[in-house]
């Protein structure tokens, strides 16, 4: 918990650079997120592909979508979970991260020093230890999160599913419902690649205790959606006289010394004819 | 035929607590959430929350939070509404209802005949 | 919240009347739905998503609007139409009904 109060921003005298003043795991251990580069990369054949259950969420559900002033975040169901992992991961919810419109490179996770557009973070509890996320967001193995990263390409129909909402919740504390869609379209193509490492919470109280999985080929969303994402939320309360745009909601890369990260993939990526073109 | 049959209605004290139940019945149970939607006499419609009885996920109007609690008995297709410290302002009656979704929004298709609950002393 | 301004509160009109409901929002939202209650009954749907009758519905009924102003119309009123009609949006937590238009017989 907080030493005092909960206020911290991204920019200005709260931002992260303070966060760690009031939030001392922020300067602690384990911190995320961090830069996927060749030499701290290591193979490991034991990483097999995760299976994602109860990921196809009815239309007939209603799902919250919630501007927290931090960033907008769907919560999921308590069904929803990863298999494949130590334990069984339960969804609670999911958020992005992103930059701005002069800058649109507002990844967490960096891969050889470049941010992509954005990130997608679906954030998992330990439901056979924990009764639920907040019990389980301090204790060792008590979160698994699944990162993907975004690039600029072509129109994303999925991400569409929750960027059309957003005008309902464009100040902090606003909500709307979403209707239940399949998550997994989320996830870019071959989710059995992927990067795997032990962090931390990348927003206070920065608790060293997720299983990250960033998967290693990023999803497409079109330069609309993203300038759509960039421009149509506010930090602040619709009634704050002093507005504050929701934009470059990401972290900096953290140290990462005398650790690895592991790979389900050994480290050559194989040209298809096509891109050979 | 799809029904919903709400119960457990009637006199309560002030501060006293009530608990209504909801019974499903002509359809996959849990592949619809359950509304608690209430009704002042001669006023209109107020939502209390929802619950997932798939999984007994609830999402509450804020106006309720701490006060309602809906809970799901998933064997015997009923979910249950529980309210506390109740005022005379909680007389209504109280309808669970099942929204359904159809092209690109929900709306309720289903309604019980809804249960009459008095707050006086 | 999204508040829901429905007016009039109440009209008395004779059958064959055109008859027009007003359901104004406070903020925008996607969607109107309108739902009919008679006395001691239920409420059951009747315009869905703005604009689309509910099967049964008879077609003297319609719903138009966007934004924040809806409305309902009845083209020729009918002895069975004399009831009660709430607006109803799901954009925003909490869904919010409208306070409700009682149409009487004159």
């Known amino acids: 918990a907080p030493v005092n109060g909960s206020k911290w921003t991204y920019f200005g005298p709260d931002g992260e650079n303070s966060w760690s003043k009031k939030y001392p795991s922020c300067g602690g251990l384990l911190q995320s997120p961090i830069d996927l580069h060749s030499d701290i990369l290591q193979y490991d054949a034991s990483l097999t592909p995760l299976e994602f259950q109860g990921y196809n969420l009815s239309a007939n559900k209603q799902f919250l979508l919630t501007n927290n002033g931090h960033s907008v975040k769907l919560n999921l169901p308590s069904d929803m979970h990863i298999q494949g992992l130590q334990s069984r991961y339960s969804a609670t919810q999911l958020h992005l991260h992103w930059g701005n419109p002069n800058d649109p490179h507002g990844s967490e996770h960096t891969v050889s020093g470049q941010h992509f557009a954005a990130e997608l973070h679906i954030v998992h509890y330990n439901s056979d230890l924990y009764p639920d996320a907040s019990t389980a967001s301090n204790k060792s193995e008590g979160l698994a999160v699944l990162a993907v990263l975004i690039e600029m390409g072509s129109f994303n129909p999925s991400y569409d599913k929750i960027f059309s909402h957003l005008q309902h919740v464009k100040y902090k504390g606003q909500e709307a419902f979403v209707p239940g869609f399949n998550i997994e379209e989320l996830l870019p193509e071959r989710t059995a690649e992927y990067y795997r490492y032990r962090g931390s919470l990348t927003t206070p109280p920065c608790n060293p205790t997720v299983l990250w999985t960033v998967f290693r080929n990023p999803v497409q969303i079109s330069q609309e959606q993203l300038l759509a994402l960039e421009t149509a939320l506010y930090c602040t309360h619709m009634d704050d006289p002093s507005p504050r745009e929701m934009i470059n909601n990401f972290r900096q890369v953290q140290k990462f010394d005398e650790r690895l990260v592991y790979t389900s993939f050994s480290q050559v990526q194989v040209c298809t004819a096509a891109g050979l073109s | 035929e799809v029904q919903l049959v709400e119960s457990g209605g009637g006199l309560v004290q002030p501060g006293g607590s009530l608990r209504l139940s909801c019974a499903a019945s002509?359809?996959?149970?849990?592949?619809?959430?359950i509304y608690w939607v209430r009704q002042a006499p001669g006023k209109g419609l107020e939502w209390v929350g929802y619950?997932?009885?798939?999984?007994?996920?609830?999402t509450y109007n804020q106006k309720f939070k701490g006060r309602a609690t809906i809970s799901v008995d998933k064997s015997k297709n009923t979910a249950y509404l529980q309210m506390n410290s109740l005022r005379a302002e909680d007389t209504a009656v109280y309808y669970c209802?099942?929204?359904?979704?159809?092209?690109?929004?929900?709306?309720?298709?289903?309604w019980g005949q809804g249960t009459l609950v008095t707050v006086s002393s | 919240d999204i508040q829901m301004t429905q007016s009039p509160s109440s009209l008395s009109a004779s059958v064959g009347d055109r008859v027009t409901i007003t359901c104004r929002a406070s903020?925008?939202?996607?969607?109107m739905h309108w739902y009919q209650q008679k006395p001691g009954k239920a409420p059951k749907p009747w315009i869905y998503?703005?604009?689309e009758l509910m099967s049964g519905v008879p077609s003297r009924f319609s719903g138009s609007g966007s934004g924040t102003d809806f409305t309902l119309t009845i083209s020729s009123l009918q002895p069975e139409d004399f009831a009660t009609y709430y607006c109803?949006?799901?954009?925003?937590?909490?869904?919010?009904f409208g306070q409700g238009t009682k149409v009487e017989i004159k």
């Open positions: 998503a703005t604009s």
């Open positions: 109803q949006q799901w954009s925003s937590n909490p869904l919010t």
């Open positions: 002509g359809y996959s149970y849990t592949d619809y959430n």
């Open positions: 903020s925008s939202v996607t969607y």
């Open positions: 619950i997932d009885p798939a999984n007994g996920d609830t």
């Open positions: 209802s099942r929204p359904i979704y159809y092209g690109a929004y929900w709306y309720f298709d289903v």
